[in-house]
């Protein structure tokens, strides 16, 4: 899977979309999970409604929401009040039994609010005596990483 980068501004909302083949994934619930470590598991953040027919209903877990357009074949995840610690590698998944197919690998990047000069990422440069933690992700809006290239490790 290629990895698609979604960039959002700290404090704002970020919408991540994961298109899929609606016929192939007919009847399947979906999930949004966060990759833990290079070879670690993908930890479930939120999943669609237990009843597949009600997948269009938005479900929240904390500041993360998920909704599924099963007819159009688009899973949408909303990250509200985006924070630097939200940056990292995620997956949109299609669930079947105890198995999960990856619909899309997503790299979430959190950009500093240009009006907010707190330490929130790679966009601003602090004073001489300070430094900021490098985001350790590849950068570009709506860019897919090259096949086989893994943008790891993410900032957690």
């Amino acid at each position: 899977h290629n990895t698609t980068v979604f960039q959002g501004v700290a404090g704002q909302s970020l919408q991540v979309s994961c298109p899929y083949d609606s016929m192939k994934h007919w009847g399947r619930r979906k999930a949004w999970c966060r990759q833990l470590g290079e070879k670690g598991p993908c930890q479930r953040v939120v999943s669609t409604h237990n009843l597949w027919l009600l997948s269009f209903l938005r479900r929240w877990n904390g500041s993360t929401a998920i909704t599924d357009d099963t007819l159009g074949g688009t899973l949408t995840i909303t990250l509200r009040n985006l924070q630097p610690h939200d940056a990292g590698l995620y997956q949109c998944q299609s669930l079947h039994g105890s198995e999960a197919d990856t619909l899309r690998k997503v790299l979430v990047e959190v950009l500093a609010d240009p009006l907010d000069h707190r330490d929130a990422g790679d966009l601003w440069f602090p004073g001489e005596s300070e430094s900021f933690e490098d985001a350790h992700v590849e950068h570009s809006i709506s860019r897919s990483l090259l096949e086989g290239e893994i943008p790891f490790p993410p900032t957690s």
Epitope: D134, S140, S156
Partner: antibody, heavy 123, light 112 residues
Framework: QVQLVQSGAEVKKPGSSVKVSCKAS????????MNWVRQAPGQGLEWMGR????????NYAQKRQGRVTITADESTSTAYMELSSLRSEDTAVYYC????????????????WGQGTLVTVSS | GVVMTQTPLSLSVTPGQPASISCRTS???????????LHWYLQKPGQSPQLLIY???NRVSGVPDRFSGSGSGTDFTLKISRVEAEDVGVYYC?????????FGQGTKLEIK
């Protein structure tokens, strides 16, 4: 194979500018940070800044900010470092260095370096 | 920025003998993702620097196993188990956990 080929040596007058180029080949230029590091005669290495060619994002060392401009041309896979208002203490060898992207087993270090460009600032 | 202090600044070693270089940093290099981005470079006379070890202890392909890196947090060490003539040059520690990236002052290794 990965190669970074830099432009030739330059002799400049104080107050002028210099633009050093770094032509990359053998890898996806757009998706790796390119760094510029300098080394004054007999001194250590000093990081000047970096650019992500895919979107032009840059970071600079605070010390040099304002005098250094790092750019990249994706069409020719070439990165540039321009240093303005040159002073004698800017006499140094300037290196471009690719930042190895974060793949499993490899990580965020400068794995390929150009051959260096000597910039001499003298009146 | 992160200040990196290398010791010693110069080292004269008999071939076949071990050598050790220390690198201390002004703040922890552990990234919030758990990784430590401390690297070692060697600059041989008249050459560009070359990457030897990345992420504290990972040898670059082609680097002899007599080179090893260790450490954590703010305290790191590069060891050469048996120095050879081709190892001469200046060794630099460097960090890429935080921007701006920084280098140590360098340690010059000479052969006795």
């Amino acid at each position: 194979q990965v190669q970074l080929v830099q432009s030739g040596a330059e002799v400049k007058k104080p107050g002028s500018s210099v633009k050093v180029s770094c032509k990359a080949s053998g890898y996806a230029f757009s998706s790796h940070w390119m760094n510029w590091v300098r080394q004054a005669p007999g001194q250590g290495l000093e990081w000047m800044g970096r650019i992500y060619p895919g979107d032009g994002q840059t970071n600079y060392a605070q010390k040099r900010q304002g005098r250094v401009t790092i750019t990249a041309d994706e069409s020719t896979s070439t990165a540039y470092m321009e240093l303005s208002s040159l002073r004698s203490e800017d006499t140094a060898v300037y290196y471009c260095a690719r930042l190895l992207r974060n793949q499993p087993g490899e990580s965020y270090a400068m794995d390929y370096w150009g051959q260096g460009t000597l910039v001499t600032v003298s009146s | 920025g992160v200040v990196m202090t290398q010791t010693p600044l110069s080292l004269s070693v008999t071939p076949g003998q071990p050598a050790s270089i220390s690198c201390r940093t002004s703040q922890s290099l552990v990234h919030s993702n758990g990784y430590t981005y401390l690297h070692w470079y060697l600059q041989k006379p008249g050459q560009s620097p070359q990457l030897l070890i990345y992420k504290v202890s990972n040898r670059v392909s082609g680097v002899p196993d007599r080179f090893s890196g260790s450490g954590s947090g703010t305290d790191f060490t590069l060891k050469i188990s048996r120095v050879e003539a081709e190892d001469v040059g200046v060794y630099y520690c460097s960090q890429s956990t935080r921007v701006p990236y920084t280098f140590g002052q360098g340690t010059k290794l000479e052969i006795k």
